[in-house]
């Protein structure tokens, strides 16, 4: 239904706390360089204005669209051109072009320092002094670094953060209570960020139809007892929610997500038997819980997929009558039977099925042509299964750090032109798949591995898009989202690459490395490893292992030495010489 004042409607629906949080996220995702105080001031002004509209929907400007209201606020910021350059040109446009322009200027890799966590005492002090401001800082810092973070989900993580601080700041040993819990939230939030970015990429590059297909597959796996009409309704609603969030319409997105959660909880009987626990929770926890609810038990009496999609004489007729519905039904039926497959794989199978029907239904004898389609799925299924087995075996053998290094070598060989920081970030993230997925039961490994890798590779593509340097990467990133991971996996050593010349300073280290946290030490070592591969792309695994072991030994020795600086300055050049010899 239409509301006289959109802003009053959303304020009433969401409540002041969530309204303010979402407006803060929206502003922080659009203008990523502004300080918290600048954004907090804007948020307060917008909230005060919303309250006047709640009191009187006919008040001046209350009938304006949210894009108009928010855009006008952003465009009124002083020194916009000095701080944001050409983004200021967006302000010369009218809605909806102005909002589109803001979206295009979102930076997936803003030049902001890493979000450093203050030490426990300081954190607890500022949290106790003003919990609202403290959480506002959290929303601002995460949102500006992750301009596509799923806004209602970020509110959920802020709530988690709040609960952890409330609990741990009351403990004697705040540090040991906070660190593991906040690390856990950070890890989950980072995964949530890359997953959501993938959804927005899908929506931006391939439109709503592509996202809806993703949603149908995912929902059918989770709710195999729901009928096709129910799955279609949920997929349509979920597509709307994600379209809104990806488009910067965060108030509508959060409101519609709450509506969807309400609908699911009111219709559990036709959706899934596993929803009750989620539905007993308050809003943010409920929606989060529903988004990762366990798969319902599959119906026992499902007929073979071939009956309706291969053996039925009506296949081409049904396909002609309603292509999207027929393909949607195929995707639904196949997905509900295969919770053990990744969504990417299911979409590849649906694409193969569609291509087969396109070819076969045009022939004189279609059934003879499409009769073997299910057998033709086999190689498509085997490829990711082999990928999971090979990689999980390697992870179990090497551990997370060693596995990351193996991936780093592999990907530097595939795309040596890519910047070392990007390669290291990608390899570290790709390597985490082992810890995240390889410990799961067999039937959960494939969906976990492939869908996580796809999300990480999407980030690689986004970063590469900004400064394209590798034809290999461009080729894999240009295709459809579901083909990316197989494309990257199939890449081999880039034969066109001219090796980087050996620079001693790249491999020169100083005693300050000794005091770095373990994670930073690893990044330094992995940076050196990538540079080695760029120098010798065809170095054997054995050669690289020799050099890296020598490097680790050198660090260990010098960091234990009484005079660290002397050790680094004398042993360092020797290490460089040995490295050159080992790789000669």
């Amino acid at each position: 239904e239409a509301h006289k004042s959109e802003i009053a409607h959303r304020y009433n629906d969401l409540g002041e706390q969530h309204f303010k949080g979402l407006v803060l996220i929206a502003f922080s995702q659009y203008l990523q360089k502004c300080s918290y105080d600048e954004h907090a001031k804007l948020v307060q002004e917008v909230t005060d204005f919303a309250k006047t509209c709640v009191a009187d929907e006919s008040a001046a400007n209350c009938d304006k669209s949210l894009h108009t209201l928010f855009g006008d606020k952003l465009c009124a910021i002083p020194n916009l051109r000095e701080n944001y350059g050409e983004l200021a040109d967006c302000c010369t446009k009218q809605e909806p072009e102005r909002n589109e322009c803001f979206l295009q200027h979102k930076d997936d890799n803003p030049s902001l320092p890493p979000f450093e966590r203050p030490e426990a005492e300081a954190m607890c002090t500022s949290f106790k002094e003003n919990p609202t401001t403290f959480m506002g800082h959290y929303l601002h810092e995460v949102a500006r670094r992750h301009p596509y973070f799923y806004a209602p989900e970020l509110l959920y993580y802020a709530e988690q953060y709040n609960e952890i601080l409330t609990q741990c700041c009351a403990e004697a040993d705040k540090e040991s209570c906070l660190t593991p819990k906040l690390d856990g939230v950070k890890e989950k939030a980072l995964v949530s960020s890359v997953r959501q970015r993938m959804k927005c990429s899908s929506m931006q590059k391939f439109g709503e139809r592509a996202f809806k297909a993703w949603a149908v597959a995912r929902l059918s796996q989770t709710f195999p007892n729901a009928d096709f009409a129910e799955i279609t309704k949920l997929a349509t609603d979920l597509t709307k929610v994600n379209k809104e969030c990806c488009h910067g319409d965060l108030l509508e997105c959060a409101d519609d997500r709450a509506e969807l959660a309400k609908y699911m909880c009111e219709n559990q009987a036709t959706i899934s038997s596993k929803l009750q626990t989620c539905c007993d929770k308050p809003l943010l926890k409920k929606a989060h819980c529903l988004s990762e609810v366990e798969h319902d038990t599959m119906p026992a009496d499902l007929p073979a997929i071939a009956a309706d999609f291969v053996e039925d004489q009506e296949v081409c007729k049904n396909y002609a009558e309603a292509k999207d519905v027929f393909l949607g039904t195929f995707l639904y039926e196949y997905s509900r039977r295969h919770p053990d497959y990744s969504v990417s794989l299911l979409l590849r199978l649906a694409k193969k099925y569609e291509a087969t029907l396109e070819k076969c239904c045009a022939e004189a004898n279609p059934p003879a042509c499409y009769g073997t389609v299910l057998a033709e799925f086999q190689p498509l299924v085997e490829e990711p299964k082999n990928l999971v087995k090979t990689n999980c075996d390697l992870y179990e053998k090497l551990g997370e750090y060693g596995f990351q290094n193996a991936i780093l070598v592999r990907y530097t060989q595939k795309a040596p032109q890519v910047s070392t920081p990007t390669l290291v970030e990608a390899a570290r993230n790709l390597g985490r798949v082992g810890t995240k997925c390889c410990t799961l039961p067999e039937d959960q490994r494939l969906p976990c591995v492939e869908d996580y890798l796809s999300a990480i590779l999407n980030r690689v593509c986004l970063l590469h898009e900004k400064t394209p340097v590798s034809e290999h990467v461009t080729k894999c990133c240009s295709g459809s989202l579901v083909e990316r991971r197989p494309c990257f996996s199939a890449l081999t050593v880039d034969e066109t690459y001219v090796p980087k010349e050996f620079k001693a300073e790249t491999f020169t280290f100083h005693s300050d490395i000794c005091t770095l946290p373990e994670k930073e030490k690893q990044i330094k070592k992995q940076t050196a490893l990538a540079e080695l591969v760029k120098h010798k792309p065809k170095a054997t695994a054995e050669q690289l292992k020799t050099v890296m072991d020598d490097f680790a030994q050198f660090l260990d020795t010098c960091c234990k030495a009484a005079d660290k600086d002397t050790c680094f300055s004398t042993e360092g050049p020797n290490l460089v010489t040995r490295c050159k010899d080992a790789l000669a």
């Epitope: 009506e314 007729k317 396909y319 239904c361 045009a362």
Partner: nanobody, 115 residues
Framework: DVQLVESGGGVVQPGNSLRLSCAAS????????MSWVRQAPGKGLEWVSS????????LYADSVKGRFTISRDNAKTTLYLQMNSLRPEDTALYYC????????SGQGTLVTVSS
């Protein structure tokens, strides 16, 4: 919505000819192979002939081979069945269908061969 409208049936004497037409709409005609099927009084559906989307490939049931010719005009989105040397056993309701479907989509057109 997919629509198939058959026409051209009638009463003919054995040995004579008829040309059936099927006007198609509501789908991408060139993307689909088309067939003619028939149902004699008191009998089940029987496949008669098929043609590929481009019109380059054709198939016939043994009972009509050499007498019937299937063709299509993709510009007019119309399917044809030229029936020569008709026999009494060709008497049936004739339907055009999409793909290899053995189903009645349209109303059909009645062909009666009798002396």
């Amino acid at each position: 919505d997919v629509q198939l409208v058959e026409s051209g049936g009638g009463v003919v004497q054995p040995g004579n000819s008829l040309r059936l037409s099927c006007a198609a709409s509501g789908f991408t005609f060139t993307s689909f192979g088309m067939s003619w099927v028939r149902q004699a009084p008191g009998k089940g559906l029987e496949w008669v002939s098929s043609i590929s989307g481009s019109g380059s490939d054709t198939l016939y049931a043994d009972s009509v081979k050499g007498r019937f010719t299937i063709s299509r005009d993709n510009a007019k989105t119309t399917l044809y069945l030229q029936m020569n040397s008709l026999r009494p056993e060709d008497t049936a309701l004739y339907y055009c269908t999409i793909g290899g479907s053995l189903s009645r989509s349209g109303q059909g057109t009645l062909v009666t061969v009798s002396s």
